[in-house]
Structures are given as structure tokens and as C-alpha cells.
């Protein structure tokens, strides 16, 4: 083993934060690996970990892609899977991860399950069925088209299966309300029986969820199959389609066939021999426990090792059970000593979020975001334009019950989708979607729904209310709304679009680009009014002035929000005005800010933090 | 012992094209991200290009477009396509081995250099 | 990008007196900081890296100090052959750049 320049940390309780987070494992995956990742030094070293959500933490987890606010640009997909600094102060000790590899558990993209009977389990590749092998979710054994997988490595020997996020099952945005597509469909008068991209000019799948289109004008937008989406080959970003013909030969999954190589691709039309278009399937990708493992035994201050069979040795390789080697037990004990670990727990499992003990102050650059770069806009031909960038989850209420030997067809009754109301106490929601100051009265936005808070003595809480009976054009998630103080016209902004509300007329949805964002912008974050018709423009850790009667960005005024504000959180996800203080909330807290609202006037005395607190207990005052 | 041998400068027109190499030895190449910096007569030194073991390339804003950078992990060779010199473009390029090595950031600074080739842009 | 100004430009001195060069960035960089030596027609020489540490070979009279945005190269006692130009570059944030040297010449 090797140590760093002798640096370690000086004490044994080590905190972390993930501050963000990659699409391509579920949250609570992420937050397990990590955790599990921590959990392997602390079971040979007297260290513990605990999760804290702030800046102030030892180890900051980021999620990043090429040059993501260090002198250590990323390299695209392999290569470079991430890296870590030495421990101390500031960005030391810190732990990145390229967000542009495939983060998995390593063994391929994690498909989570619908309905079935394994309870929202991932897939497993590969798993057997009827004694064939299948690399991603397959329609065989079912004559419906609906995809499924087998939640464990052999379906014919465990039984135990679930659907792949498909079309049939539910869509996603749009106006039909999460309802599958119906096919076939009449769209200009032409029948679909799969979902098309035609009427559209961003490439987005989409359906109708009746069966005519142009009499209904129901839509949705068509799930991803993330299992299924070729990299390469000539139709990178295009779907497998099975089965396909090879050489004259039906294929339900993946093949190796014909390559030397071994690697598995599929056609991406159902006949390769006469359309010749295909590309490789998904990776096994890289484990993120593994390599959180690897990057973590840096930030407490281990080189590299030159046995090759030890965790810190610097090629990846994938491998079941506890990854170290006696070379890394020793380097970490000769860092902490032997002694045992005070709590014999898991160490990483603090649920409660504390509030920041101060302001955080950290401005790392912008990081990879979990929207599509660009965002969907109205085709030529009227196809409709989706609503908000993450999905709803409401799906079929009917779980079917397996067969025999083959998952069952999908009954009719899992295509009925009920949207539930939230727990009519606001005090129960971790973080709102966006809060804005409209008409008067503080509005909680939350998957669809609304509450009115009125800062007056014996005048209560309002709601929850339909945010769709209010304004019904808009989606159901929102990423902010804002009035515009002057005028009372009220922007709502989701994904790529906004709306504007001038009482019950909207306009819109328009596409960012028509208000001068470049489709890097996948969402608005907020606004901040200005004086004289102008207001501050909030995204991702950058901040434009915005024409509020032209509704038009000043390309040339885009500066970092720590410029102007500091000490905020660089990825506020929702910045409201309220009382005449600019609030910038986080997870559960705000930030509170002083706020020189004088167009082109920046008071860096002025726009200085002077709050922090919860959104809940401080701004909605609950108990 | 480490070397890094430049290759390639010379009198060049504005407009014109020049290929930098440079032979690596003594250490394993394949391994390092490799630097070409430049230093113009009498001036202070500003880098130029940077090629990661994966390939990955990152260019200075005033190459950006004209200059490509590129390794040969098996002939140990570090490479400078120069495309549309111009008179700001003289200067003595040296290639430099990056100290850091792989996941661990840190070992900032550049712990060999070659001798520099001189590459003068002028009609 | 960061912008890293070097002091003094010129720094005239005799063999045995101490040298203190400075070279201040224009915003954190924590402690990702070279210096380098560089004497007529030859290449640059790493002598410190990340602050404070000194490279191969480097003799122990040289010695860096510094976190942030303030760092100090210090020549405890000038020998004939430190006389040079010395450059300061930081990988704090990227791009990387370099400060625009200081002449160290002899009095």
C-alpha cells in the first residue's frame, strides 16, 4: 500500500454529503452504495461515516461530467470513472464521479420492475427463461407486447418477474394522465400500432391513450427503455426491436452472434438482414459501490496499490464480497490504527436531515443534470408537446398474477390509473416542488396540487387544491412559478416550457429557446424580480436577466449565482421572492437572502445570506 | 530516466500547417495525460493542449478549432497537428508529462519537460 | 478562468540573502499549486507541487507554503544557480494557467 503525502484525517467520525445525484440508479440505491462503500473501511478501521446534507461535510459526493468545477476534467464514457483529493479543508477529500459512464450495481443497467410479484425489484441480467438466456426485459412468453424481466437470475427455477417500464403499462407527461397507449391509434388520420416521433421534430416517442388522437387529442410521452437503447453501431440512441431476423434467424434479445468479439448488440428494425441498421446493447456498466469504495479509500488518504488483487489497485474490475485485500487493511489501519469501530452499525444511516449549521459557501460548477439536453418542442404537424421533465408515478391499480411457466397477459384492469392526492398536510412533504408568492399568498406546489399559506394571524392554511382547476394547462409536476409584480401575469416553468398566466388566459407552452436559453438549460430554478419590468433568471447554478415584457434573456448578463449571491446553495432547486427577501431552498432548508432588487445594481453587501431554516417548520410554520 | 524528445518546429507561413512530436521514454506513456505548452519569445508560458490516457482532448481557447492533439500509446509518441498557424502561434512548444497518474488528484505539476521545439509563423 | 499575478516582477538579490516570491489567484484553489524554474534556453523545472511539497531532486532550500489564494516560494539562502525566472501555475480549477513569471536576478 501507499499513503498520501502522510495526510489523513484527524479525527475518526467522518462526515459526507451527496450532494447530487445520477439518473442512472435510483436515489435510494445511490444513497445504499455509498453507504455500503463508507461501511467497508469503518468494518477494519475505527472510522465512522455519517450523512449530512451540507457543505460543511469532510467528503462531498458530486456527480459530475467533463469539466465539472475542478482542474480535473472527466473524459466521457470509461476511461476515467472518477476520482478523489487527499483529506483536508475545502474540495480536499472530496469524491467525484463521472456522470457520463453507466453507474450500476456492475452488472447492467438497473431496470426497476412494475406490478409482477417481486415487488418493484430491478430486473436481473441475465436471467433464464424456458432456458434461453436474456440480457435485457423481453416479450416473449406473453402475447400482449408488454415487456418483463425476472427479478432473479433464473425465472423458470424462482417465478419471480416484473414489467419493464413500457408504453402498455403507463406514459409519461403529456395530458393523458399517465394512462398506457392505446394501439392502434389515428393520428392525421393514419394508424399507429407502436409510438411514433412523427408530428415531432425533437425525436420524443409519444401515443394516444384513445384511440384517436386527432377526434381526443389525449397524449403521452412513450417511457425509455434504458435496457434496450444501443450505444454505437449505427443507430446509437435508437431502441432494440424484438424480435429481429439475423441471418435468417429470430432473435428475442441480445446477440454476440456474428461478432468476434463477444459483444452483444441488436438490430433496431425487425429485420437486420434487409434494413442492415443495429448497435450494442447496454454495458454491464460500473459498479458504483466498487468504485465509491475505491475513490473513498483516496479521500481518507490512500494511494494507489501495486497488488493487483487490492480494492485501491487502479483498474477497475468487477467482483462479488467484501472487496479488500489484506494490502488495503493494512494501509488504512496504518492510517487509523486497528482498534474497532466504536458502533457496530451501519454507519451511514442518519435519516433526519439537520438544519446547516451555516450558510453553505461552496460554488462548485454546474453538474450533469437528469433532463434531456434538449427539450421536447411542438412538431410541424400539431403532435402535441410534453409536460413536465420527471414523471408521474401513479400506474395500473390491477397487479397481474403469474402463470404457470410465462408472466401473465396484462388484464384490462391495469390500464385504469388513479391519481392520488398527497397527505392533506403539507408538513408531511420532504420538498415542494415550487413555492411562489402569488396574489398575495405564499403557493406550495406539490405533483399537481397546491397550498395557499396567508401569513395572517387566525387565517390558516389553504388546500390542497387541483393545480389543473386552477390552471389547467399546466403539467402536474413544476420546477417554479413566479409573478410578475407589476403586471400579476404568473410564469410557471417545467422541464423546458413555461406558461404564462394572465388570469385565466395562458400562453404557452413555449419552449426556453424562444425566451434565448440554449437547450443546456433543462429547467428554470426560479425568478427574482427586478425593478422596471426586468427580473433575475435562475438555472443551475447560473444566473440571466430576463426581459419580463419580452420575456427575453439577456444572453450577455449570464454570471454564477455565487457572483451575485453568495453563500448560497449553487443548486437551489427553486428560488422564490417572498416579503421582500429572495429565498434559495435546498433539500428541506432556504437560504434567505437580503435582496437589492435596483436593475443592474448588485449590492454585494446587500444580497448577503442572513437566514437559513426549513421550509416547513420556518416558512409554512408547522410544528 | 524519464525523456521527452520534441520534434517537427521550423519556419512556418500564416496559414500553413505544422505536425509537433514527442518521443516519451523511461516511464510508462500510456498511463499519464501528456501537455503540450508553448512559450512565446521573451514571454511567460501558457498551455496549449492536454490528452488524457483514454484519448480525451482539451484545447486552449486560442487552438480551439485549429490545433489536434493525439498519442500513439504504442510507438510511446505524443503528437501536434497544427492547422492555420497565425503570427501568435511562434513560440517554443515543449511537451510535458503530467505528475498526477489516474484517479487520485493531487500530484499537481508537470515533472518533465522536453527541450522545446521552436515553431516561428511568419511570411 | 483564475488569473494568477506573480510579485514582485523583478527581484534583485545576492548569493546567501533569502527569496520570497509571491503569486496570489484570483479566487480559491485550494492548494493545487506549482512553482517552476526556468533558466535561458532551457525548459521549465518542477520544483514544488501542491503548495508545499517539493519535487525530486529539489534542494531543501526551497520551500513552499500557501492555501487559498496566497502562496509564497521561499529561497532560504540564494546559491549562483537559483537565479532565474521562477512561474507559479495552478490546477484549481481549469483551465490551468500560470502567473506571468518573476526574474529573479542577481544584485
Known amino acids: 500500500f501507499q499513503t498520501f503525502k502522510g495526510l489523513k484525517w484527524d479525527h475518526h467520525n467522518i462526515t459526507y454529503w451527496i450532494q447530487n445525484y445520477s439518473e442512472d440508479l435510483p436515489r435510494d440505491m445511490i444513497d445504499d452504495a455509498f453507504a455500503r462503500a463508507f461501511a467497508v473501511w469503518g468494518e477494519v478501521a475505527p472510522l465512522t461515516f455519517t450523512r449530512v446534507y451540507g457543505p460543511e461535510a469532510d467528503i462531498v459526493i458530486q456527480f459530475g461530467v467533463a469539466e465539472h468545477g475542478d482542474g480535473y476534467p472527466f473524459d466521457g464514457k470509461d476511461g476515467l470513472l472518477a476520482h478523489a483529493f487527499p483529506p483536508g479543508a475545502g474540495v480536499q477529500g472530496d469524491a467525484h464521479f463521472d456522470d457520463d459512464e453507466l453507474w450500476s450495481l456492475g452488472k447492467g443497467v438497473v431496470i426497476p420492475t412494475y406490478y409482477g410479484n417481486s415487488n418493484g425489484a430491478p430486473c436481473h441480467f441475465p436471467f433464464t427463461f424456458e432456458g434461453r438466456s436474456y440480457s435485457a426485459c423481453t416479450t416473449d412468453g406473453r402475447n400482449d407486447g408488454t415487456p418483463w424481466c425476472s427479478t432473479t437470475a433464473d425465472y423458470d427455477k424462482d417465478g419471480k418477474f416484473g414489467f419493464c417500464p413500457s408504453e402498455r403499462l403507463y406514459t409519461e407527461h403529456g395530458n393523458g394522465e399517465g394512462k398506457p397507449c392505446v394501439f392502434p391509434f389515428i393520428f392525421e388520420g393514419r394508424s399507429y400500432s407502436a409510438c411514433t416521433t412523427k408530428g415531432r421534430s425533437d425525436g420524443y416517442r409519444w401515443c394516444a391513450t384513445t384511440a384517436n388522437y386527432d377526434q381526443d387529442k389525449l397524449y403521452g410521452f412513450c417511457p425509455t427503455r434504458v435496457d434496450a437503447t444501443v450505444v454505437g453501431g449505427n443507430s446509437a440512441g435508437e431502441l432494440c426491436v424484438f424480435p429481429f431476423v439475423f441471418l435468417g434467424k429470430q432473435y428475442s434479445s441480445c446477440t454476440s452472434d456474428g461478432r468476434r468479439d463477444g459483444r452483444l448488440w441488436c438490430a433496431t428494425t425487425s429485420n437486420f438482414d434487409t434494413d442492415k441498421k443495429w448497435g450494442f446493447c447496454p454495458d454491464q456498466g460500473y459498479s458504483l459501490f466498487l468504485v465509491a469504495a475505491h475513490e473513498f479509500g483516496h479521500a481518507l488518504g490512500l494511494d494507489h496499490s501495486s497488488v493487483p488483487e487490492a480494492l485501491m489497485y487502479p483498474l477497475y474490475s468487477y467482483l462479488e464480497g467484501f472487496p479488500l485485500n489484506k494490502d488495503d487493511i493494512d494501509g488504512i489501519q496504518y492510517l487509523y490504527g486497528r482498534g474497532s469501530k466504536p458502533d457496530p452499525r451501519p454507519p451511514a444511516t442518519t435519516t433526519t436531515e439537520p438544519q446547516p449549521t451555516a450558510p453553505p459557501t461552496m460554488c462548485p460548477t454546474i453538474p450533469p443534470t437528469a433532463y434531456p439536453t434538449v427539450g421536447p418542442t411542438v412538431g410541424p404537424t400539431g403532435a402535441p408537446s410534453p409536460g413536465p421533465t420527471s414523471s408521474p408515478s401513479p400506474g395500473p391499480t390491477g397487479a397481474p398474477s403469474p402463470g404457470p411457466t410465462a408472466p401473465p397477459t396484462a388484464g384490462s384492469s391495469e390500464a385504469s390509473t388513479e391519481s392520488l392526492s398527497p397527505a392533506d398536510n403539507p408538513c408531511n412533504v420532504d420538498v415542494f416542488d415550487a413555492i411562489a408568492e402569488i396574489q398575495g399568498a405564499l403557493h406550495f406546489f406539490k405533483d399537481g396540487w397546491y397550498w395557499k399559506f396567508l401569513n395572517h394571524r387566525g387565517s390558516p392554511l389553504q388546500g390542497p387544491f387541483l393545480t389543473a382547476r386552477t390552471w389547467p394547462a399546466l403539467p402536474a409536476t413544476l420546477d417554479s412559478a413566479f409573478e410578475d409584480p407589476q403586471t400579476k401575469r404568473v410564469f410557471f416553468f417545467s422541464g423546458r416550457q413555461m406558461w404564462v398566466y394572465t388570469g385565466k388566459t395562458v400562453l404557452g407552452p413555449r419552449s426556453l429557446d424562444k425566451l434565448g436559453l440554449g437547450p443546456e438549460v433543462t429547467h428554470v430554478s426560479g425568478l427574482l424580480p427586478r425593478r422596471l419590468g426586468k427580473a433575475l433568471l435562475f438555472s443551475k447554478g447560473r444566473v440571466w436577466r430576463f426581459d419580463l415584457k419580452s420575456q427575453k434573456v439577456d444572453p450577455q448578463s449570464v454570471i454564477r449565482v455565487d457572483k451575485e449571491f453568495s453563500g448560497v446553495p449553487w443548486n437551489s432547486h427553486d428560488i422564490f421572492q417572498y416579503q421582500d427577501k429572495a429565498y434559495f431552498c435546498h433539500g428541506k432548508f432556504f437560504w434567505r437572502v437580503s435582496f437589492q432588487n435596483e436593475v443592474n445594481k448588485v449590492d454585494h453587501e446587500v444580497n448577503q445570506v442572513d437566514d437559513v431554516g426549513y421550509v416547513t417548520y420556518d416558512l409554512l410554520q408547522c410544528p | 530516466e524519464v525523456q521527452l524528445l520534441e520534434s517537427g518546429g521550423g519556419l512556418v507561413q500564416p496559414g500553413g500547417s505544422l505536425r509537433l512530436s514527442c518521443a516519451a521514454s523511461?516511464?510508462?506513456?500510456?498511463?499519464?495525460d501528456m501537455w503540450w505548452v508553448r512559450q512565446a519569445p521573451g514571454k511567460g508560458l501558457e498551455w496549449v493542449s492536454?490528452?488524457?490516457?483514454?484519448?480525451?482532448?482539451f484545447y486552449a481557447d486560442s487552438v480551439k478549432g485549429r490545433f489536434t492533439i493525439s498519442r500513439d500509446n504504442s510507438k510511446n509518441t505524443l503528437y501536434l497537428q497544427m492547422n492555420s498557424l497565425r503570427a501568435e502561434d511562434t513560440a517554443v512548444y515543449y511537451c510535458?508529462?503530467?505528475?498526477?497518474?489516474?484517479?487520485?488528484?493531487?500530484?499537481?505539476?508537470?515533472?518533465?519537460w522536453g527541450q522545446g521545439t521552436l515553431v516561428t509563423v511568419s511570411s | 478562468e483564475i488569473v494568477l499575478t506573480q510579485s514582485p516582477a523583478t527581484l534583485s538579490l545576492s548569493p546567501g540573502e533569502r527569496a520570497t516570491l509571491s503569486c496570489r489567484a484570483s479566487?480559491?484553489?485550494?492548494?493545487?499549486l506549482a512553482w517552476y524554474q526556468q533558466k535561458p534556453g532551457q525548459a521549465p523545472r518542477l520544483l514544488i507541487y501542491d503548495a508545499s511539497y517539493r519535487a525530486t531532486g529539489i534542494p531543501a532550500r526551497f520551500s513552499g507554503s500557501g492555501s487559498g489564494t496566497d502562496f509564497t516560494l521561499t529561497i532560504s539562502s540564494l546559491e549562483p544557480e537559483d537565479f532565474a525566472v521562477y512561474y507559479c501555475q495552478q490546477r484549481g480549477n481549469w483551465p490551468i494557467t500560470f502567473g506571468q513569471g518573476t526574474r529573479l536576478e542577481i544584485k
Open positions: 492536454v490528452i488524457y490516457p483514454s484519448g480525451t482532448t
Open positions: 510535458a508529462k503530467d505528475r498526477a497518474y489516474g484517479d487520485y488528484v493531487g500530484w499537481n505539476g508537470f515533472d518533465y
Open positions: 479566487q480559491s484553489i485550494s492548494s493545487f
Open positions: 523511461g516511464f510508462t506513456f500510456s498511463q499519464y
